[in-house]
């Protein structure tokens, strides 16, 4: 029987007695920055090249005895998880190891930086196929380590890192907090977040997805044929590095943005028990467990989108929060969320030649989050159309007036502290799907995009009585690009996208009171690209 | 996942024109910043990554490193350049006393300085 972790990441069509999906990452080189490794272990022999790179601090303690098997343990196991003959994810991938962690599993930011620089120089000297860099380590937040990861990612390298084993917000650690890195948390056989002693997997908005990371069988450095069970977010990251190698081997031209979107798209959704996470982190933490795509080709036709949460704005009156998409992604919509409900909405604005999503805190508010919907839309031309507050009873409205432009998202932003507490709700006139409608005291922002074959439609779900959560989902074949609430009244905490579902959260029912003011409508904008579908069919 | 994450310590050392009379003073209005790990036991004081501005060439990095050593020596401090970065980030790794940070932050081309810190297997 195959180990539970390999079964978990394998789509049913691959499941046989032996885990042998096609094309095991043979076109890809995976760099491992870790401890030394036992390269003659039968799991990884001939698959891992040990580079001459070594930059490690001395071991702590006068009584420390270097024992080869202990020094090699972490790295050997991870190399086995990525590419091991029996228990590896990408059995065809070749690996190169750099020693940046000592026999106690400790390294330095500077040593890691020099290691990343070594990889970049190797890439320049001898360009090969796609590169994946596995960083199964974590330290405190480091501006310089995050910057180095950003530069390497922009040079076309896919970086995968451990979220950290501190049962804490991954944004407080590096390289986990680097936006360009794929950050991986750990789950177990029951799809629960992994507990490790008194701690466990990190969580939060800096985690991209989770992967198997408890009781993972892999190569043991105790002997050349030994196996052992190890656990941690390093093991989880190794699974994702292996999956990335498989995907890149099947589609070597994939960009980092495309790869990340595919990893998210093919993940198992909503299987993690979120009760394990601190309450304030649940909404920010992706409920995704990594899996291999069911087919190595043919995913190109889909419109891929993901949700990116900003850092918390902080509680000051004029505080704002900004969410950004990756360089190759389009910001198709922008929403905001505040636990206290005190916010002044959100807007899309240009920053450094790119659209960003900015959310505004309100007086007395505990702070806000900006939520960006970031999508892969080749040849897109997007712009934001704004209507200032209308001061008319019909409310503020704005539409996409340019020929061939479709509405992908609506945002609203207001300067008044308490928007429409005693105002009747504003409803969209039927048959006008290409416009955003909002409160008369709010300015409304429409995200309008033109892209070959792009079509969008609006889907609403309204609930007359107060409810803590209203959702509306896009149907199969359509992708959620926009998520907002109608009306923009004060009891709405905000709106955000979870996979293909638009979620609108309201204040606790018990405090709202059942008035007409309680009516909440979730508005989803669902899009698809016929152009991408046609291009995909032509390829096949 | 942003550089703005606030829960790590940022020490901004204000720059004043001092006795050194630098040939190339930092551009007006830009202040180099100092960063260190918020988790005290993980800090490695005495080793610093000096990050230079994005377009700085290798030769300028080497020159800046040498200038730091010379100015430190004039003050009676020993420094050791452990590595000069190029390829990913321009800058250098230096072993020196924390007393020299204010001096280092005033060097030309300096964007920020980060104290080295530990990373751990996960």
């Amino acid at each position: 029987s195959i180990p539970w972790n390999l079964e978990r990441i394998t789509p049913p069509r691959y499941r046989a007695d032996e885990y042998q999906p096609p094309d095991g990452g043979s076109l890809v080189e995976v760099y491992l920055l870790d401890t030394s490794i036992q390269s003659d272990h039968r799991e990884i022999e001939g698959r891992v090249m040990v580079t001459d790179f070594e930059n490690v601090p001395e071991e702590d303690g006068t009584r420390f005895h270097r024992q080869a098997s202990k020094c090699d343990s972490h790295g050997t196991h991870l190399a086995g998880v990525v590419s091991g003959r029996d228990a590896g994810v990408a059995k065809g991938a070749s690996m190169r190891s750099l020693r940046v962690l000592n026999c106690q599993g400790k390294g330095t930011v500077s040593g890691t930086l020099i290691g990343l620089e070594f990889i970049r120089k190797s890439q320049l000297v001898q360009p090969v196929g796609p590169l994946v860099v596995l960083l199964p380590l974590a330290g405190g937040y480091s501006r310089v380590l995050n910057a180095a990861c950003q530069r390497l990612a922009r040079a076309g390298v896919v970086l995968v890192t451990a979220a950290g084993n501190f049962r804490d917000d991954a944004c407080l650690y590096s390289p986990a907090s680097a936006p360009e890195v794929i950050t991986v948390g750990a789950t177990n056989a029951q799809d629960q977040p992994v507990t490790l002693g008194t701690l466990g997997t990190n969580f939060g908005r800096c985690v991209d997805l989770f992967a198997p990371g408890e009781d993972i069988i892999g190569a043991s450095s105790d002997c050349s044929t030994c196996f052992v069970s190890q656990s941690g977010t390093s093991q989880a990251a190794a699974h994702v590095a292996g999956i990335a190698a498989m995907m890149l081997s099947a589609e070597p031209e994939l960009t980092l943005a495309e790869l990340r979107q595919r990893l998210i798209h093919f993940s198992a959704k909503d299987v993690i028990n979120e009760a394990w996470f601190p309450e304030d982190q649940r909404v920010l933490t992706p409920n995704l467990v990594a899996a291999l795509p069911p087919s190595t080709h043919g995913a190109g036709w889909q419109l891929f989108c993901r949700t990116v949460w900003s850092a918390h704005s902080g509680p000051t009156r004029m505080a704002t929060a900004v969410a950004r998409c990756a360089p190759d992604e389009e910001l198709l919509s922008c929403s905001s969320f505040s636990r206290s409900g005190k916010r002044r909405g959100e807007r899309m604005e240009a920053q450094g030649g790119k659209l960003v999503c900015r959310a505004h805190n309100a007086f007395g508010g505990e702070g806000v989050y900006a939520i960006a919907r970031c999508c892969l839309l080749p040849q897109a031309n997007c712009s934001v159309h704004t209507a200032p507050p209308a001061e008319a009873s019909m409310g503020t409205r704005v539409h996409c007036h340019q020929q061939g432009h479709v509405l992908t998202g609506c945002s609203s932003h207001w300067e008044v502290e308490d928007l429409g507490t005693h105002k009747p709700p504003v409803l969209r006139p039927r048959g006008q799907p290409n416009q955003c409608v909002g409160h008369r005291e709010a300015s409304i922002h429409a995200s309008c995009c033109h892209a070959p074959g792009l079509e969008c439609k609006v889907k609403e779900h309204g609930i007359p009585a107060p409810q803590e959560q209203v959702t509306v989902a896009c149907e199969e074949g359509w992708t959620l690009t926009g998520c907002s609430a109608l009306p923009g009244t004060s009891h709405v905490l905000g709106a955000y996208a979870v996979d293909n579902t638009c979620v609108v959260r309201s204040r606790d029912v018990s405090t709202t009171g059942s008035t007409s003011e309680g009516a909440v409508t979730a508005v989803a904008i669902c899009c698809r690209s016929r152009h991408l579908a046609q291009a995909s069919q032509e390829l096949q | 996942q942003e550089d703005e994450d606030g829960d790590y310590e940022e020490l901004v050392l204000a720059l004043r024109s001092e006795e050194d009379g630098l040939a190339e003073a930092p551009e007006h209005g830009t202040t180099a910043t100092f960063h260190r790990c918020a988790k005290d036991p993980w800090r490695l004081p005495g080793t610093y990554v000096v990050v230079l501005k994005e377009e700085t060439h290798l030769s300028q990095s080497e020159r800046t490193a040498r200038r730091l050593q010379a100015q430190a020596a004039r003050r009676g401090y020993l420094t050791k350049i452990l590595h000069v970065f190029h390829g990913l980030l321009p800058g250098f790794l230096v072993k020196m006393s924390g007393d020299l940070l204010e001096l280092a932050l005033k060097l030309p081309h300096v964007d920020y300085i980060e104290e080295d810190s530990s990373v751990f297997a996960q």
């Epitope: 029987s1 106690q104 002693g197 408890e214 069988i217 043991s220 044929t225 196996f227 069970s229 | -």
Partner: antibody, heavy 130, light 107 residues
Framework: EVQLVESGGGLVQPGGSLRLSCAAS????????MSWVRQAPGKGLEWVAN????????YYVDSVKGRFTISRDIAKNSLYLQMNSLRAEDTAVYYC???????????????????????WGQGTTVTVSS | DIQMTQSPSTLSASVGDRVTITCRAS??????LAWYQQKPGKAPKLLIY???SLESGVPSRFSGSGSGTEFTLTISSLQPDDFATYYC?????????FGQGTKLEIK
């Protein structure tokens, strides 16, 4: 599904010897510590011995130290218990069991997280009698 | 060596009852405790590990709690299949000891 099958039990005189074997399937066998546990007729469970994945560490209950030897052969996916100087009180059903546990990094070294004996064989009977 | 003491030795109960079995360690074992169920002529079966974690495939009516020296196994609503003998087991530095067992029988 991992399966454990014990063999080698039987009737032996006091002072005699027996070698118990436990055959396992798959790489999951060699990935964990393994234990022998016994149960005397009508009595409770008693842990006898265990062995690390590579055989480098072994532990025994006091009552069998110096008489019993636990070993394993990774190539054959087998666990053994060599029992010498047998006594009447060694009469029991002997089970081999997998000790599921995992190692994780913390505080500058590996920590061991133990789950328990999650896979057991059907047992083999050892009777020590004259 | 650490001794494990289970109580009661025998427990009579009816289907639908909530039952609790206690296990005491002679010294602190943190949370390193497992619970097993054994039926006559069969090998034991792992129910709970690390004092409170439910083993995969075990019904949720079984739960464990405690740390240090006092531990309990609770069956929230007894089912006919639950009548068996239950053992606690401590893990400490790679050597183990079991409790003497609690026989759960039909009233």
């Amino acid at each position: 599904e991992v399966q454990l099958v014990e063999s080698g039990g039987g009737l032996v005189q006091p002072g005699g010897s027996l070698r118990l074997s436990c055959a396992a399937s798959g790489i999951t066998f060699s990935s964990y510590w393994m234990s022998w546990v016994r149960q005397a007729p009508g009595k409770g469970l008693e842990w006898v011995a265990n062995i690390k994945q590579d055989g480098s560490e072994k532990y025994y209950v006091d009552s069998v130290k110096g008489r019993f030897t636990i070993s394993r052969d990774i190539a054959k996916n087998s666990l053994y218990l060599q029992m010498n100087s047998l006594r009447a009180e060694d009469t029991a059903v002997y089970y081999c069991a997998r000790d599921r546990g995992t190692y994780y990094y913390a505080d500058g070294g590996y920590n061991y997280y133990y789950y328990g004996m999650d896979v057991w064989g059907q047992g083999t009977t050892v009777t020590v009698s004259s | 060596d650490i001794q494990m003491t289970q109580s009661p030795s025998t427990l009579s109960a009816s289907v639908g009852d909530r039952v609790t079995i206690t296990c005491r360690a002679s010294q602190s074992i943190s949370s390193w405790l497992a619970w097993y169920q054994q039926k006559p002529g069969k090998a034991p079966k792992l129910l709970i590990y690390k004092a409170s974690s439910l083993e995969s495939g075990v019904p949720s009516r079984f739960s464990g709690s405690g740390s240090g020296t006092e531990f309990t196994l609770t069956i929230s609503s007894l089912q006919p299949d639950d009548f068996a003998t239950y053992y606690c087991q401590q893990y400490n530095s790679y050597s183990y000891t079991f409790g003497q067992g609690t026989k759960l029988e039909i009233k």
